[in-house]
Every structure is written in C-alpha cells, then in structure tokens.
C-alpha cells in the first residue's frame, strides 16, 4: 500500500463514547487468529482476539467480530482519556503476523470551553495533527510484523 | 475558500428522520477526522459522532444505534443520518473538520412531540 498507506488513521472519540473499526483481511487468512492490540513501546499488547476466551473479564470494553468474507469488526466502549493512543488490527496469517490496520485515537474532553470555538472559520487551538509524527520512511503495511 | 456548510436540519415529529449534510471546500477533504456535534441553549456543546479520514466511527450513547456517520470524500461531504428523533435531540448541530480545526455555521434540528 505504500507509505501513506502506512499512516494510521485519525480518529477522534469523545469520552464515554464507542467506536467502531473494521479491518479487512486476505480471505486465505480466514481461519487465523486476528487480534486487537494497543501499540506500546514494548510492542503491540493484544487486548482481545478472535480466540474463543472463556475467561474473559465481565467488565471487558473491547469486542472483536469477525464477520466473514474477510471483513473484521472492532468495537470499544466507554472510552476513557487513557485509552488514547496508537492501535492495530493484526492477523497471525500465512505469512507470519501482519497490521492489517492502525488507528490513532484521541479522546475529545467530556466539554470544551467555549471561546475555543470559531464557528465557520479556523479555531486557534487547533489540534496536533498526530499522524503528522509518523516516519515517512517506515515500511509498508505488508513489511510489518508485530514487534 | 475553507469553509464547511451544513444543511438538511429542520422540524420533524416524535420518530421522524433526517439527513444532515456538510459541504466542505479549501481543506483536503479526504485526509480530515470528522465529527458533528450539538449544542442546546442549556448544555455545552457536545460531540455526537466522529468519523475517521478511513471511515472508522465513533457515536455517544444517547445516539447510538439511531445515528449513522458517513462520507463521501469524492464529494467532499460528511453526513448525518439521524432515525427515531426524539425532542431531547433538538439542538443546533455543527459539523467540525479536525485538521485544519474548522467549524460550520450550524443547522436547526427541532422535534416536536
């Protein structure tokens, strides 16, 4: 997908909202494990996946879906400030682990003050744009591979 | 010019649907995180629902399930369609890019019960 393929997508989310994310995969991966990770320093951690967990928390805020002909569903809830941050769709496929998909969360605050706001026109605190850090020589999605 | 243009808000009853759209020109459309909020004379403005430039989606659980995000970036268009409106929906509803951060003028919505 090349280099701006690479880039994650920019999702903004305000506090206590849900978002939706789908990752599409290479229908030979049909019957691999896909997982939900948050990207950290340390590597991805995987938050859920498509693994049947029986042990799974009852107050769990991530659901994943896989909905067939290739097409995978991400759902998180109740999203809070600290859930901010960099997240992946991955697939332990033929071709070893891939990042089908990453998203950059931002969290918007519960209320923004007012003055903030310059109705039809530029605001001045305009956000950071945060896939503005990515590198742009990092490699394809197709080069990935989970750390 | 960079500007975002709403449009579709209007008066409809207890039930009814409506499909707001946001024209946007002077900003790359395609790359922008989208979102459309609301604001009511007696609470903050909030936001509804958001779009991500790929089209992940984010939606407040007030209008979950009845609200649907979407766009149409070889039209430069965000869009809001909004089912099963209820009185508490009646608000002024902007649509805001979030890079450059820019908002539209806003659209009544009122539902009469």
């Known amino acids: 997908q090349g280099i701006v393929g690479s880039l994650p997508e920019v999702l903004q989310a305000p506090v206590g909202s849900s978002i939706l994310v789908q990752c599409h995969y290479r229908l030979q991966d049909v019957k691999a494990q896909k997982v939900w990770c948050r990207f950290l320093p340390e590597g991805c951690q995987p938050l859920v996946s498509s693994a049947v967990d029986r042990r799974a928390p009852a107050g769990r805020r991530t659901f994943l879906t896989d909905l067939g002909g290739g097409l995978l569903q991400v759902e998180m809830v109740t999203l809070q400030e600290e859930d901010a941050g960099e997240y992946g769709c991955m697939v332990d496929g033929a071709r070893g682990p891939q990042i089908l998909h990453r998203v950059s969360l931002n969290i918007l605050p519960p209320e923004e003050e007012e003055e903030t706001h310059k109705i039809g026109s530029l605001a001045e605190n305009a956000f950071s744009d945060p896939a503005g850090s990515a590198n742009p020589l990092e490699p394809s999605q197709d080069e990935k591979s989970i750390p | 010019q960079v500007q975002l243009v709403e449009s579709g808000g209007g008066l409809v009853q207890t039930g009814g649907s409506l499909r707001l759209s946001c024209a946007a020109s002077g900003i790359s459309f395609s790359d922008a995180a989208m979102g459309w909020y609301r604001q009511t004379p007696r609470k903050s403005r909030e936001a509804v629902a958001t779009?991500?430039?790929?089209?992940?989606?984010s939606y407040i659980d007030a209008v979950k399930g009845r609200f649907t995000i979407s766009r149409d970036n070889a039209k430069n268009t965000l869009y809001l369609q909004m089912n099963s409106l209820e009185p508490e929906d009646t608000a002024v509803y902007y649509c805001?890019?979030?890079?450059?951060?820019?908002w539209g003028q806003g659209t009544q919505v009122t539902v009469s019960s």
């Open positions: 779009i991500g430039n790929r089209g992940s989606v």
């Open positions: 805001r890019s979030f890079q450059p951060d820019l």
